[in-house]
Every structure is written in structure tokens, then in C-alpha cells.
């Protein structure tokens, strides 16, 4: 006995009232011609003619998935019984945005869950949300094709002064977080060492408070705070920063011993370990990866290794004793 054995019993599908033998007879030599697959789909078991009662399976091209019942059945009248089936995109296409906007990362297709960031030239901000996530086959929030860049009020206010300052006669004074920051400015993720907490803050407010000597505020990254590697690294770099000998202002941020301020983006970018200069008395004794041996590294090397998300355990500050 075999469960796969065919004793010629006609099948009844859940949604069928009749057995196939009860359907009107057509000449025995007839069948069904190849059906037309949905857009972006194809027939898996492709051939010229199909027997009555035979099923064909609809498959979708890479980047698409079937929605609906994916089998067509050949009927005795030579037609196909087919439910609603379509091939829906499982990836998002790179959005079409105005030329002034830069998309990062720049790819042709994005997988579900991947995000993009829209940025503007220096002195301008995105007039709307700057971060979008691929969900299903569309972007969330939806990307308006009229989205553009607008003059950054921060830049207008500051004149020849530094970020967080404004021109007052011939001198520069700190902006007031309450009075000068009522306009829209992009969101930043910020860490407060006093409360040991991170939160989303408008750039204007953050810079104004930092100018007013609020040293406990640390920039983590552009955009609202979202759990993930960027936030994790932002918090870790804040902890490491207290021992950094270099503190170089760079856009919203401050660059430390293991970083370089990118002139084109005004962002701190981690160096790679071989770019670290040997100098500096900020040393750490560490264990790398699954190694049992101890190693003495300088703060630059420690910062670059942690930034690259390589496994490293800091055993203690200072040289290894052995």
C-alpha cells in the first residue's frame, strides 16, 4: 500500500462542488494550452499542453513573492481555473527624489527592514522626515516626490558664528534653547551623562545647550534615537571619550583620538586600526576575540577596534603587567 498510489479516484478540492468526472466531457485529445502567468511571475512546470486535472504552479521572479493561491487547474473545457494570484515586490526600489537630495546608502534595491537617510548640502536641511524604512514593497513614511531641501535656520541665525551661537551686533552669543529654537531643525540622538539617558533632541536645542556650557550632553548620531548598533556605539564612544586627549569640534559632534573629522560631511569617522599613531599615554590592557593572551593597546587602537565592532575585552587601564 502506498499513499502516493493513484487508484484513479477524482479529487474534490475544498472549494469545489463537483468531481472532475461530473464536468462536461470534451474530446479526449484536448487539454489546456500554457496559461499566462501574472506580471513578474513564471510557470514552474512549463510545457505546451497540459492534461485535464493537471495543476501548474506559479512562481515569482527574485525580489517578488506570490500573494494568493499559486496553482492553476486545467479544466475539461480547455480553460484554467485560477484564483487571484499576483507577484508582489519584496524589495523597495530606490526612490526618485529631487537632485539636491543625497540618498545614503545608494543602492538599486533595498531589502525589507533596510533604511535610507536623505541629506542636503551644507547649510540646508530636509524639509520633512530624513529617514525612511523599506516595509513590504514601499517606503515608510511615504516619500513625497516634492520633498526638497530648505535653508537651515541654524545657519541663517549663526551668521559668522559657530554652531549654537548667533550674531549679536559684532559679537557671537549663545542661542537661547527656548527663544531661538522654535523653528524646525533636524533630529539628533543625544546622551545626557547626568541622567545617564539618551533622547531625541532638535539640533538647535542641543547646540544651544552645549554652547551654554552644558558639558554633560553628548551627540550620538543624526536622526532620532533607534535601538541598534549606531546607538550602542554612540554610548560606548561617549564612555571612552573621557580619556581622549583629542577633542576636535566637527559639525554637531566632537572627534576623539580614534577619529577624523570628514571635511566633506562634517562627521567624525573612525580611523582603521593601522591608521593609529603610536603616541599617547592612554593605554589599555585588553584581550582580543577568543584569544587568551593579553595585549597593550593605545586609546586610538581600542576606539577603532570597538568602532569596527570587533570583539575585545578591556581588562584594565594601563599597560598589561605580564
Amino acid at each position: 500500500f502506498s499513499i502516493m498510489e493513484n487508484n484513479g479516484q477524482p479529487c474534490i478540492n475544498d472549494d469545489e462542488e463537483m468531481k472532475e468526472v461530473d464536468l462536461p466531457e470534451i474530446e479526449a485529445d484536448s487539454g489546456c494550452p500554457q496559461p499566462v502567468p501574472p506580471e513578474n511571475g513564471f510557470i514552474r512546470n512549463e510545457k505546451q499542453l497540459y492534461l485535464v486535472g493537471e495543476d501548474v504552479e506559479i512562481s515569482c521572479l527574485t525580489g517578488f513573492e506570490t500573494v494568493g493561491y499559486q496553482y492553476f487547474r486545467c479544466l475539461p473545457d480547455g480553460t484554467w481555473r485560477q484564483g487571484d494570484v499576483e507577484c508582489q515586490r519584496t524589495e523597495c526600489i530606490k526612490p526618485v527624489v529631487q537632485e539636491v537630495l543625497t540618498i545614503t546608502p545608494f543602492q538599486r534595491l533595498y531589502r525589507i527592514g533596510e533604511s535610507i537617510e536623505l541629506t542636503c548640502p551644507k547649510g540646508f536641511v530636509v524639509a520633512g522626515p530624513s529617514r525612511y524604512t523599506c516595509q513590504g514593497n514601499s517606503w515608510t513614511p511615504p516619500i513625497s516626490n516634492s520633498l526638497t531641501c530648505e535653508k537651515d535656520t541654524l545657519t541663517k541665525l549663526k551668521g559668522h558664528c559657530q554652531l549654537g551661537q548667533k550674531q549679536s551686533g559684532s559679537e557671537c552669543i549663545c542661542m537661547s534653547p527656548e527663544e531661538d529654537c522654535s523653528h524646525h531643525s533636524e533630529d539628533l540622538c543625544v546622551f545626557d551623562t547626568d541622567s545617564n539617558d539618551y533622547f531625541t533632541s532638535p539640533a538647535c536645542k542641543f547646540l544651544a545647550e552645549k554652547c551654554l556650557n552644558n558639558q554633560q550632553l553628548h551627540f550620538l548620531h543624526i536622526g532620532s534615537c533607534q535601538d541598534g548598533r549606531q546607538l550602542e556605539w554612540g554610548l560606548e564612544r561617549t564612555r571612552l571619550s573621557s580619556n581622549s586627549t583629542k577633542k576636535e569640534s566637527c559639525g554637531y559632534d566632537t572627534c576623539y583620538d580614534w577619529e577624523k573629522c570628514s571635511a566633506s560631511t562634517s562627521k567624525c569617522v573612525c580611523l582603521l586600526p593601522p591608521q593609529c599613531f603610536k603616541g599617547g599615554n592612554q593605554l589599555y590592557c585588553v584581550k582580543m576575540g577568543s584569544s587568551t593572551s593579553e595585549k597593550t593597546l593605545n586609546i586610538c587602537e581600542v576606539g577603532t577596534i570597538r568602532c569596527a565592532n570587533r570583539k575585545m575585552e578591556i581588562l584594565h587601564p594601563g599597560k598589561c603587567l605580564a
Epitope: Q107, W233, K260, K267, V269, P273, P274, Q275, K278, N309
Partner: antibody, heavy 118, light 112 residues
Framework: EVQLVESGGGLVQPGGSLKLSCAAS????????MAWVRQGPGKGLEWVAT????????YYRESVKGRFTISRDNAKNSLYLQMNSLRSEDTAVYYC???????????WGHGTLVTVSS | DVVMTQTPSTLSATPGQSASISCRSS???????????LYWYLQKPGQSPQLLIY???DLGSGVPNRFSGSGSGTDFTLKISRVEAEDVGIYYC?????????FGAGTRLELK
């Protein structure tokens, strides 16, 4: 001015050995990681190996692991590449390179030619 | 290993005109903290390579500002706004976002 001068290249038979040297000047040699990069005839560039300040950490591309050894002598301001079990595909101009905060390979020597042939 | 594909392999440019070279990586060079380690080098005839652009778009020390870099993710471009005779040579892109570091096969720039 940073100067890197390679030497030690030449013709060697497959399976043979060769030791390349790089003499560094114009900077404090012991303060920098150093690297070797090669360029096969009519081919692109290929990173070979990197060494840290004191030689306690070394890194190699997969195809040369176990055959090549990068080392340094900080007292002599010199970088070395000991190449054993040489193969024809190791034929290339070998460059000595130093990083900066801008790039991993910011300064390059003029190169020394290694030809592996029978 | 990450494969870096450069196009075109040869580029004929008219002095004073602009020229662009494309570099595409087999996987994204943007790491999980938002950094992209993409560099451009020029190797002039009979010389060793020299750094032009680092971190996608920053100009190397002493490099004329007619050179500029752009791009993100997997697609990058080097642009020369006004080609000069001294720009002749082979241009290489290089990535250091993933080990091992890898270079493109090069684009030869020649003058028309």
C-alpha cells in the same frame, strides 16, 4: 619628507625564497603600522600584509599566509618581507606603504620587482 | 572578498572637459555605524600610486580640487571637473570596509 625605499627584488625559481627590505626615513618609524602592497604585471593592486608598531601583531592576505612573513627592525628603521615557497602568481612589483589619518596606504615607495619563473 | 568593479576600463578625455569613473562594490561598504571606507588612487606612468580621495569624498592632502568623489552603499564615482595633461594614468578605487582590503582593476585615463 616621508621616504620609503624598497630593495631585494629579483628573479627566483618557483619554490624559492627571497627577502625584501624597505628603508624608511623622514618620520618616526616606530610610531606607525607598515604594510606591503603588490602589483602583478598588467594587473591591479593587491594588499599583502600589515604589521603593527612593534611587530607583535601581523596580518596577511589568505593566499600568502604560511609562506610570507612581515617583520620590522625599529632600530634600523626597516621593514621586511620574507617570501618562501614562491609561486608564479607572486610575480609583481612589491611596494612598501605607510598609513596616515587619511588612508591606510598614504605613502608609497617606488617598488621592487619580484619575478618567479623557471 | 569584496569585488570592486570599475568602469570604463579606458577613458579618453579632452583637456578642459570633465571625466567620470564609476566604481561598484559587490557588497555595501557602509558599515553599521555609518562609515564608508572607499578611496581613490592615481598611478601616473612609471610612478607609484598616490592618494586622491579618502572616505568617499574627502580630498587628499595637496590634491587639486578639480577632483571630487561621491556615492554611497555600493556605487561610487570619481569626477575630474577639468582634465589636465598631468591627470593621465591609471585610477584605482579601493575599499577597506571589509577584510581583506581590495582594489578595483583600474581605469586608464588618456587624452584625446
Amino acid at each position: 619628507e616621508v621616504q620609503l625605499v624598497e630593495s631585494g627584488g629579483g628573479l627566483v625559481q618557483p619554490g624559492g625564497s627571497l627577502k625584501l627590505s624597505c628603508a624608511a626615513s623622514g618620520f618616526t618609524f616606530s610610531d606607525y603600522y607598515m604594510a606591503w602592497v603588490r602589483q602583478g604585471p598588467g594587473k591591479g593592486l593587491e594588499w599583502v600584509a600589515t604589521i603593527n608598531y612593534d611587530g607583535s601583531s601581523t596580518y596577511y592576505r589568505e593566499s600568502v599566509k604560511g609562506r610570507f612573513t612581515i617583520s620590522r627592525d625599529n632600530a634600523k628603521n626597516s621593514l621586511y618581507l620574507q617570501m618562501n615557497s614562491l609561486r608564479s602568481e607572486d610575480t609583481a612589483v612589491y611596494y612598501c606603504a605607510r598609513p596616515s589619518t587619511e588612508a591606510l596606504f598614504a605613502y608609497w615607495g617606488h617598488g621592487t620587482l619580484v619575478t618567479v619563473s623557471s | 572578498d569584496v569585488v570592486m568593479t570599475q568602469t570604463p576600463s579606458t577613458l579618453s578625455a579632452t583637456p578642459g572637459q570633465s571625466a567620470s569613473i564609476s566604481c561598484r562594490s559587490s557588497q555595501s561598504l557602509l558599515n553599521d555605524v555609518g562609515n564608508t571606507y572607499l578611496y581613490w588612487y592615481l598611478q601616473k606612468p612609471g610612478q607609484s600610486p598616490q592618494l586622491l580621495i579618502y572616505l568617499v569624498s574627502d580630498l587628499g592632502s595637496g590634491v587639486p580640487n578639480r577632483f571630487s568623489g561621491s556615492g554611497s552603499g555600493t556605487d561610487f564615482t570619481l569626477k575630474i571637473s577639468r582634465v589636465e595633461a598631468e591627470d593621465v594614468g591609471i585610477y584605482y578605487c579601493m575599499q577597506a570596509s571589509h577584510a581583506p582590503y581590495t582594489f578595483g582593476a583600474g581605469t586608464r585615463l588618456e587624452l584625446k
